[in-house]
């Protein structure tokens, strides 16, 4: 039996700048019951309060409501392990909340096959932003990708669209079926998640119709 | 046709600002994305940034994140470069480029150039 | 960031020689390859997107070939006004780079 290892805040992510949850690594517990706390300050402030919501995002975490997230105030955050033999705490870790935003992916995905006027066939592929991004007023800015792969093949090929919502996919088989998925990823923050496949084949005889 | 037309050469001080226009016509200016380039005398070229007019989205070179902001006047059809707080080894020649309409990143049309010095 | 790295730096050639310039992504960029051409003076010109599609207009001496990390554009007979600087740049994600130039000229 020993005091517990040194908890490590694993990451801290925000959805949309409104609110945003930290997980941690517990360490060993020593072979005791271990209590965990996380515990934060904002710089320039003396207070130090304590996790506001322990359940929300699951085991090891804590998340801030918005009622408890500021936007431009880094905050300071630590873990604090306690058993009967002792107690260990984490690094800190600096998190400002515009830096850490992995926003939900792309929807409203579409697949069109279509065809330029020399007879190429070309996917196109159209997505809308997530939902909770407010992109018209500059709140969010979004860079996406999509990949895609047919059915058969093993790796993905990935395609970086910029801030267009919409891309052109070429060079595609005849008769087979391709999946697609899209992400995105704003300013300062992480690529969202892939989102929802869809599929679509290729027809072997594609026409243009009126 | 495709034409970007640039702004006249400058001349400026260190620590000032600098402002390059790149006018657009004879295509649709919100389809596709603008990017700026520049080359120093006698070297290679080096990517600053791009701007999508459709949502106004910005994408930059880190080298130029804090230093350089990319706008677009969709009324005009007119995208703009401003550099800060220049020092000499900004004097260089300034592309805008517009970027292919599918693929973000190769540029199909160029502007003549803006050269801009930096000198005391 | 994705390092670009063309060779050779310089390259000495006659009218009608083929030539090759080859470009080297420090990571797999795919097919997300564009060359330019650069004439003094001149901002660049578009000559190869996607590694291997011809822009409008040029001629189809000039071709691009290769997927990955290695890419080579290739003039099958040249000009008189293929002598100029060429640039490769990859178009895979920001922030896009140049390879530092092959400056072509005649012997």
């Known amino acids: 039996q020993s005091p517990p290892g040194k908890p490590e805040i694993h990451k801290c992510r925000s959805p949309d700048k409104e609110t945003f949850t930290c997980w941690w690594n517990p360490g060993s517990d020593g072979g005791l019951p271990t209590n965990y706390s996380l515990t934060y300050s904002k710089e320039g402030e003396k207070n130090t309060y304590e996790c506001p919501d322990y359940k929300t995002s699951g085991p090891n975490s804590c998340f801030f409501s918005k009622q408890y997230t500021s936007i431009w105030k880094i905050y300071i955050i630590t873990v604090n392990a306690t058993n009967e033999m002792g107690s260990s705490t984490s690094d800190p870790l600096y998190v400002d909340v515009t830096y850490i935003v992995e926003p939900e992916p792309p929807r409203n995905l579409t697949l069109e096959v279509k065809q330029l006027k020399d007879k190429k066939t070309y996917l196109w592929v159209k997505w809308l932003p997530p939902t909770i991004t407010d992109v018209k007023t500059g709140w969010f800015t979004m860079e996406y990708e999509i990949r895609l792969k047919s059915e058969e093949a093993d790796e993905w090929e990935i395609h970086f669209t910029g801030h267009q919502t919409q891309f052109k996919v070429f060079d595609l088989y005849p008769g087979q079926k391709y999946l697609v998925q899209t992400r995105c990823k704003p300013d300062h923050g992480y690529w969202s998640r892939w989102g929802q496949e869809k599929s679509i084949e290729i027809p072997n005889d594609f026409t243009l119709k009126d | 046709e495709v034409q970007l037309v640039q702004s006249g050469a400058e001349v400026k001080k260190p620590g000032a600002s600098v402002k390059v226009s790149c006018k657009a016509s004879?295509?649709?200016?919100?389809?596709?994305?603008i990017h700026w380039v520049r080359q120093a005398p006698g070297q290679g070229l080096e990517w600053i940034g791009y701007i999508y007019p459709n949502n106004d989205g910005t994408g930059y070179n880190q080298k130029f994140k804090s230093r350089a902001t990319l706008t677009v006047d969709n009324s005009t059809s007119t995208a703009y470069m401003e550099l800060r707080s220049l020092r000499s080894d900004d004097t260089a020649v300034y592309y805008c480029a517009r970027g292919d309409g599918n693929y973000v990143g190769d540029m199909d049309y160029w502007g003549q150039g803006t050269t801009v010095t930096v000198s005391s | 960031d994705i390092q670009m790295t063309q060779s050779p730096s310089s390259l000495s050639a006659s009218v009608g020689d083929r030539v090759t310039i080859t470009c080297r992504a420090s990571e797999n960029i795919y097919s997300y390859l564009a060359w330019y051409q650069q004439k003094p003076g001149k901002p660049p010109k578009l000559l190869v997107y996607?590694?291997?599609t011809l822009a409008e207009g040029v001629p189809s001496r000039f071709s691009g070939s290769g997927s990955g990390t290695d890419f080579t554009l290739t003039i099958s007979s040249l000009q008189p006004e293929d002598f100029a600087t060429y640039y490769c740049q990859h178009h895979y994600a920001t922030p896009f780079t140049f390879g530092q130039g092959t400056k072509l000229e005649i012997k």
């Open positions: 996607n590694a291997k």
């Open positions: 004879g295509y649709t200016f919100t389809d596709y994305n």
